[in-house]
Interface confidence: medium
């Protein structure tokens, strides 16, 4: 069965200064490749978190991504401000050479 990316929460309400939890799960280990979180869609979308590389000081993962069969890619974003408002997408990439390829979005 083909991998699905599931974002169960249609909206999340967070007070300024608090932490937002954005939930995302995948239904399969295959295809192998990282999850990335974006705010917005299309060419101008903003990268919020990349599981594979980069430094995202306000973002932590909800679960231990080093555990074998954990397919929970939920994140927490700390110290929320009004500027963080928007629609967030959890996107699965397929591992490729030389570049990973977008596979499916929540």
């Amino acid at each position: 069965e083909e991998l699905q990316v599931i974002q169960p929460d249609k909206s999340v309400l967070v007070a300024a200064g608090e932490t937002a939890t954005l939930r995302c799960t995948a239904t399969s280990l295959i295809p192998v490749g990282p999850i990335q979180w974006f705010r917005g869609a299309g060419p101008g979308r903003e990268l919020i978190y990349n599981q594979k590389e980069g430094h995202f000081p306000r973002v932590t993962t909800v679960s231990d991504l080093t555990k074998r069969n954990n397919m929970d890619f939920s994140i927490r974003i700390g110290n929320i401000t009004p500027a963080d408002a928007g629609t967030y997408y959890c996107v699965k990439f397929r591992k490729g050479s030389p570049d990973d390829v977008e596979f499916k979005s929540g």
């Epitope: 280990l29 594979k52 993962t61 991504l65 074998r68 890619f73």
Partner: antibody, heavy 121, light 112 residues
Framework: QVQLVQSGAEVKKPGASVKVSCKAS????????ISWVRQAPGQGLEWMGW????????NYAQKLQGRVTMTTDTSTSTAYMELRSLRSDDTAVYYC??????????????WGRGTLVTVSS | DIVMTQSPLSLPVTPGEPASISCRSS???????????LDWYLQKPGQSPQLLIY???NRASGVPDRFSGSGSGTDFTLKISRVEAEDVGVYYC?????????FGGGTKVEIK
Amino acid sequence: QVQLVQSGAEVKKPGASVKVSCKASGYTFTSYGISWVRQAPGQGLEWMGWISTYNGNTNYAQKLQGRVTMTTDTSTSTAYMELRSLRSDDTAVYYCARDQGTGTTVDLDLWGRGTLVTVSS
Amino acid sequence: DIVMTQSPLSLPVTPGEPASISCRSSQSLLHSNGYNYLDWYLQKPGQSPQLLIYLGSNRASGVPDRFSGSGSGTDFTLKISRVEAEDVGVYYCMQAQGTPYTFGGGTKVEIK
């Protein structure tokens, strides 16, 4: 680029300890575990254990339990493997390998170049 | 511990010809999630091992399509459809179904 760089060769006396380092670069260190694998001269591969870079949880091979300690320093993206009470049969090349990044990779997809540890009186 | 048995121990091959390596485990490597936790690695002379196949049949990134993995449960096979000179080295299967991970004894592939 994505790589694991290991510390240099060591020569130790029986009964001594050795600590091998493995510095990761080019990827998010805490998204992948680290396994340590050793290879005695002319022999096959032996898995020593695994550490979660996320929370420091470890899983050691039973035969090394009590002699091996695996740690990480997330501030420098470095994993360490310390082996104590060294014996001559611990002479081997010690490899670190990137392991178990959920959904990102499965098992040992990136290896260091190895560190030769020689135990000799 | 799960015991991994590889055969043959040594495999002389002719470039352009196919080659096959067998790996058998003492316990099933089929996880309840439907995946077989069996990998294949190649250690070329003087180098670190490199991942070829994961989860029994999935080629790792950058691995040529002449390599394929098959099998389920306790019996697995690595096939090279047409051996090239650069394929020489020692091939290892490894189970990651349970800890400790265990490797097969290795199969040395050399050119005839």
